[in-house]
Interface confidence: medium
Amino acid sequence: GIAIPRNSGCPNSEDKNFPRTVMVNLNIHNRNTSTNPKRSSDYYNRSTSPWNLHRNEDPERYPSVIWEAKCRHLGCVKADGNVDYHMNSVPIQQEILVLRREPRHCPNSFRLEKILVSVGCTCVTPIVHHVA
Amino acid sequence: GIAIPRNSGCPNSEDKNFPRTVMVNLNIHNRNTSTNPKRSSDYYNRSTSPWNLHRNEDPERYPSVIWEAKCRHLGCVKADGNVDYHMNSVPIQQEILVLRREPRHCPNSFRLEKILVSVGCTCVTPIVHHVA
């Protein structure tokens, strides 16, 4: 974060370890200015490295529902619809921030948590290890 | 989230619209149990839909740095290294949560914000619109 002299209009922090614990307004602001951003919604079927999406729900996490990608094949789909095993379908992973209720079940106390999620799949040339 | 009679160990909320404003501990817990999860770090070069990563920094946001993917080509790279324009490289996008300082510059007060980020690229068969 940025260190700036405290604004007189800022809420006070009672935490001596400031700002380890902060106040967060959960009314989400959607920064996607376009009313219909071009989403990846049909790419999972049209990709040469197609994937399925699996629903992961955890009521102690915020957001409680995350959809995770799992590649359908080890290889990549060719134009004729067959799978080419000389190429690899691999998940594209991203670390995202979520809020985890802490202590558990407390409705207004969270801890930031980093989790690794698979967002989709891409087709890559494999790394070939040559044995001498 | 889960609604359970409030735990006596839970912090109190002074927000009448409870729990719109919550306390968040910014000491991030990393849920990626493996010390070296298999990341997508080299896929951006090896993919048939390669991408470049661009650094997006915003000191009023947490995390302040986000890396955004931009596909290198309109088409997809073939085995011979040439680009096939009968296929399309497209970004895989994901909505993620970030914290936005609110009011601006306040070190301990944030609002949740949803932003759409491009995580990587995948190669898809184009949608062909036939004109009657």
Partner: antibody, heavy 123, light 106 residues
């Protein structure tokens, strides 16, 4: 005002397919999943599955796997449920309902429902 | 799949009476939702996450429970409460509903 408006009643022959639509308004379509629930005449409620309009992710009740397809069109904020190889016991009212993916004041439950679409399967 | 069994199936009650509907799950669930449905209407979310009243639900309604046993209670029944009530779990796939409890006003 949140609204889920479904397509009109359908009469189908056994073996045919039906596609029910559900147009959402009054909220951000991609912030909520769309679940489909059916109710046979005089019977209880049966969950069929869910689609996330943002990712296209689907999870179906295994009972309907292979016969049902759920899709969305984010440009028109419309969800669709197609059921194939219809049988007489598929005669039911089909409901779409939304379920929040995010927080705010959301109850993490199926909080708004469409008016229902009666599908009658009869030879 | 988790089977939810409601009791009773049907109850005829006089106004001002206290009503208790139970929902028993075949396996433990983390919480329960309840829906109200009147004839020729769509279901309405009534109680969510075991004990929270949905918007517009009168305070005479309450919900409680944990594990496999959950309860919907109406403290003092009113004529407008005549309806069928369904419990619903979403702890495991497929999501399931109870068979419903029909409340009739005497």
């Amino acid at each position: 005002e949140v609204q889920l408006v479904q397509s009109g009643a359908e009469v189908k022959k056994p073996g045919a397919s039906v596609k029910v639509s559900c147009k959402a308004s009054g909220y951000t379509f991609t912030d909520y999943e769309v679940h489909w629930v059916r109710q046979a005449p005089g019977q209880g409620l049966e969950w069929m599955g869910v689609i996330d309009p943002g990712t296209g992710g689907v999870a179906y009740n295994q009972k309907f796997e292979g016969r049902v397809t759920m899709t969305t069109d984010t440009s028109t904020s419309t969800a669709y449920m197609e059921l194939r190889s219809l049988r007489s016991d598929d005669t039911a009212v089909y409901y779409c309902t939304r379920y929040s993916l995010f927080y705010g004041s959301s109850p993490y439950a199926m909080d708004y429902w469409g008016q229902g679409t009666l599908v009658t399967v009869s030879s | 799949e988790i089977v939810l069994t409601q009791s009773p199936d049907f109850q005829s009650v006089t106004p001002k009476e206290k009503v208790t509907i139970t929902c028993s799950a075949s396996s433990s669930v983390n919480y329960m939702h309840w829906f109200q449905q009147k004839p020729d209407q769509s279901p309405k979310l009534w109680i969510y996450r075991t004990s929270n009243l949905a918007s517009g639900v009168p305070s005479r309604f309450s919900g409680s429970g944990s594990g496999t046993d959950y309860t919907l209670t109406i403290n003092s029944l009113e004529a407008e409460d005549a309806a069928t009530y369904y419990c619903q779990q979403r702890s495991s796939y497929p999501w399931t509903f109870g068979q419903g409890t029909k409340l009739e006003i005497k």
